[in-house]
Interface confidence: medium
């Protein structure tokens, strides 16, 4: 049952072979030295690879994972806040370091960096007011969230704020901009002729990353942004507010950073680690910082701003939320209130602060220079009941299980690295700085990265985003795992997942999504080209159309939220541990890497068809400027044929020959790397993957052939169409070349 994929009965020797096995070869003189070395290597590898301990297989690893342990770890990680850059989070880093050592990892080190973080001023709180014609504040938004029951006396709960907002006290008329998406500003500016210049805009959270909202508002000329959680997006009908249910109360507020880093990491040291001898940019040259004040509020406060709005009516029903207000767009207040203005009071500061990653190593027995990485962040906005500690607790249990096997004498074939990242909430800083520091090792040795942030965002079904190389791994693994879902007793996870979340393209298969960003896999996948994946339990997107989960980044994201409402038995957490841990086990232990390059061929064709159909919305321009996709389709066809032949060779080659095995595995490992363009995407040098990038309009979403997509976006509005279509042609060229070049890495080497 556990013999998944290729030859994955791959437990290796319980200890390294004695060195004397290959010592005899060294007596061969001079010209025979290399032959002797290889001979010794052959003996070592084949012995180790065939010395299988049945006790130490995938099943043993998975059976060791316990829901009760995950529950205990979650409780332990969520009793106080662990904000990045604070003493509490440093202490948790040291605790995790100590426990991972106890669990049996070979080494566990702290990796520290000094990065730009952002905090509210403790004596000068941030708030928004309505002011009358005399400048008197007649209404002020709340300064903090009412703490949940049992947490009233907890200190160091950071009040709601938008991290990296500049200081400022702008005042002006309000304009309601819906979700502040690109299309929302198009509607306002182009259709409704509403000018946001010099206005304070109010936008509802949801649909897209908050940093994109702020960028869009800046480009529209706004002088401040108010973000709020509308019940339409964060209050599921029929569910009570916390603490009686999992809905957002009116005083609850979503924290979060509002950067537009585009993969840069620390804003002051883009491309390089923020170490002791780093050269730091001045704040004016820092990457991705917003230029206008931004502040988040809850729907109690939002109602008091929105109910007075005048000006234009909402353009259509998609602009109306669920508050009992008119959702007028403005600008400004109506009738009696037209002389009143909105004023922001923002006093947060940006500070270079030390952060700490925890890096644990379990050395591989056969290929110690091949790294499989499992990483998730540790820092939270407040208690982190879901984000991140539901993920960190799962990582902790996975480490414990691997450690248990290691203490019994087992080792994985390849090295496994475990990471507890810091400062993810401030822009993926811990993971990015570590990857910048270790980029040369990672690009040569990185096999795969599995992300482990929040294990749950619902309790309906599995959700997986990954490289196409991992599709078959995920399918085969989930077919072997039991579903935790009610009504699927005795059925596989694959079956419940496929039933609840079917693929839109392939019947009988589950949906697997593209990787976007907004989490710690970004630097590994989008910058370095290391095959990556993530898995968590999610909500029913059909019936729950709210964005994320209602209590995301609020003070109400507690242990009790998870234990009472999401996963009382921790069975969904256990399933996620099995998926994440199972993927790591297979990636680190299978003799042949569990990557199927044919799945990349399939999606490349799909993505080429999609981008071609977008381009064909402009048939006249395509003809006028001689735009052809022939080169791209030809490259995809070549990739498909070469991938097919490679897969045939993969079935047939002599797996007892370690040189050939290593060669084939390297071709698989380096395929993802082959999609990296060293020059990066236009204006986004750290997004270097040609097939996937975070959407320019929503960091959370993945876009395929992003260079071509962005060149085509809104092309009809470009001032110089000849130049614009020239860029489309250039991007088609880059994409076609990259696909062809990647294909050739799979060809026979000589």
């Amino acid at each position: 049952m556990w013999n998944l994929l290729h030859e994955t009965d791959s437990a290796v020797a319980t200890a390294r072979r004695p060195r004397w096995l290959c010592a005899g070869a060294l007596v061969l003189a001079g010209g025979f030295f290399l032959l002797g070395f290889l001979f010794g290597w052959f003996i070592k590898s084949s012995n180790e690879a065939t010395n299988i301990t049945p006790k130490h297989n995938m099943k043993a690893f998975l059976d060791e994972l316990k829901a009760e342990n995950i529950k205990k770890f979650l409780y332990n990680f969520t009793q106080i806040p662990h904000l990045a850059g604070t003493e509490q989070n440093f202490q948790l880093a040291k605790q995790i370091q100590s426990q991972w050592k106890e669990f049996g990892l070979d080494s566990v080190e702290l990796a520290h960096y000094d990065v730009l973080l952002s905090y509210p001023n403790k004596t000068h709180p941030n708030y928004i007011s309505i002011i009358n014609e005399d400048g008197n504040e007649i209404f002020n938004t709340s300064l903090f969230e009412p703490p949940p029951p049992g947490y009233e006396n907890v200190s160091d709960i950071v009040p709601p704020f938008s991290a990296f907002s500049p200081q400022g006290m702008p005042e002006g008329d309000l304009v309601y901009v819906n979700y502040a998406r690109t299309e929302d500003f198009f509607k306002l500016e182009r259709d409704m002729k509403i000018n946001c210049s010099g206005k304070i805009v109010i936008a509802r959270y949801g649909k897209v990353f908050r940093g994109n909202k702020v960028k869009n508002a800046q480009l529209a000329g706004a002088k401040g942004v108010i973000l709020y959680s509308d019940p339409a997006d964060y209050f599921a009908p029929g569910v009570k507010s916390y603490p009686d249910g999992w809905n957002l109360p009116g005083g609850g507020v979503q924290r979060g950073n509002i950067l537009n880093l585009n993969g840069a990491g620390d804003p002051l040291t883009p491309g390089y680690p923020a170490n002791e001898y780093a050269y730091r940019r001045g704040i004016a040259e820092a990457v991705g910082l917003p230029s206008i004040p931004v502040h988040p509020i809850g729907y109690y406060d939002a109602q008091k701003l929105l109910e007075k709005m005048g000006g234009s009516a909402p353009p259509d029903s998609s602009w109306r939320g669920s508050l009992k207000v008119p959702y007028n767009v403005g600008p400004g207040f109506t009738g009696n209130f037209s002389t009143q203005k909105v004023k922001m009071h923002i006093h947060s500061t940006n500070e270079v602060t030390r952060i700490y990653n925890v890096i644990g190593t379990l050395r591989g027995a056969v290929e110690p220079d091949r790294y499989v990485i499992l990483g998730g962040h540790r820092d939270s906005w407040v208690f982190g009941g879901i984000d991140p500690q539901s993920g960190a607790a799962v990582v902790h249990e996975i480490v414990r299980s691997f450690g248990t096997l290691k203490k019994e004498g087992w080792r994985p074939r390849r090295t496994i690295l475990f990471a507890s990242w810091d400062a993810e909430e401030f822009g993926l800083l811990g993971s990015t700085e570590w990857a910048e520091e270790n980029s040369r090792l990672l690009q040569e040795r990185g096999v795969a990265y599995i992300n482990a942030d929040s294990s749950i965002e619902g309790n309906y079904t599995l959700r997986v985003d990954c490289t196409p190389l991992m599709y078959s791994l995920v399918h085969n693994l989930t077919k072997e795992l039991k579903s935790p879902d009610e009504g699927f007793e005795g059925k596989s996870l694959y079956e419940s997942w496929t039933k609840k979340s079917p693929s839109p393209e392939f019947s009988g298969m589950p949906r697997i999504s593209k990787l976007g960003s907004g989490n710690d896999f970004e630097v590994f996948f989008q910058r370095l080209g290391i095959a990556s994946g993530r898995a968590r339990y999610t909500k029913n997107w059909e019936t729950n159309k709210f964005s994320g989960y209602p209590l995301y980044h609020s003070v109400y994201e507690t242990y009790e939220l998870v234990e009472k409402f999401y996963d009382p038995m921790f069975k969904y957490h256990l399933t996620v541990a099995q998926v994440r841990g199972g993927m790591v086990f297979e990636l680190a232990n299978s003799i042949v890497l569990p990557f199927d390059c044919r799945d990349y061929a399939v999606v490349l064709r799909k993505y080429a068809d999609k981008i071609y159909s977008i381009s064909m919305k402009h048939p006249q321009e395509m003809k006028t400027y001689s735009v052809s996709f022939d080169s791209l389709f030809s490259a995809v066809k070549n990739f498909t044929e070469i991938a097919s032949k490679f897969s045939e060779r993969l079935q047939d080659f002599d797996k007892s020959n370690p040189i050939v095995l290593r060669m084939m595995n390297d071709q698989l490992m380096f395929l993802e790397r082959a999609f990296i363009d060293p020059l990066g995407l236009p204006d986004r040098p750290f997004y270097r993957h040609v097939i996937y990038a975070p959407s320019s309009h929503n960091k959370y979403a993945g876009e395929s052939f992003p260079g071509i997509y962005d060149a085509l976006f809104d092309i009809e509005s470009k001032v110089d169409p000849s130049k614009a279509w020239g860029e489309v042609k250039r991007q088609i060229y880059v994409a076609a070349f990259t696909v062809q070049a990647a294909a050739e890495t799979l060809s026979e080497v000589a």
Epitope: P231, P237, Y300, D301, Q303, E307, S322, L323, K324
Partner: nanobody, 119 residues
Framework: EVQLVESGGGLVQPGGSLRLSCAAS????????MYWVRQAPGKGLEWVAN????????YYVDSVKGRFTISRDNAKNSLYLQMNSLRAEDTAVYYC????????????WGQGTLVTVSS
């Protein structure tokens, strides 16, 4: 748990006055519009008055305009209805009600206090 408790009802002669109070708990009182609603014997519910969260906007049914005054004290989580020049047709059970902020969410009602106007 949301709770609304009315008090101040009783028997009063025509032309007399009463002041109804409503003590609110279990929610952020200052964030909600509040209402007084009444139900006369054998009749349906009738909206009487409502007030916005800050107390700056007040609305009344025509039959009570100039006689009734709705007010609130957010510091005390309390809603009031000052009823002057009472008439026999004002006899009813008076309910304090909290609007929902959210479309489709149910409102909350108190148990009511009986006002009887009779000589």
């Amino acid at each position: 748990e949301v709770q609304l408790v009315e008090s101040g009802g009783g028997l009063v002669q025509p032309g007399g006055s009463l002041r109804l109070s409503c003590a609110a708990s279990g929610f952020t009182f200052s964030s909600y519009w509040m209402y007084w609603v009444r139900q006369a014997p054998g009749k349906g519910l009738e909206w009487v008055a409502n007030i916005n969260h800050g107390g700056s906007e007040k609305y009344y049914v025509d039959s009570v305009k100039g006689r009734f005054t709705i007010s609130r004290d957010n510091a005390k989580n309390s809603l009031y209805l000052q009823m002057n020049s009472l008439r026999a047709e004002d006899t009813a059970v008076y309910y304090c009600a909290r609007d929902s902020l959210i479309v489709g969410e149910r409102g909350y009602w108190g148990q009511g206090t009986l006002v009887t106007v009779s000589s």
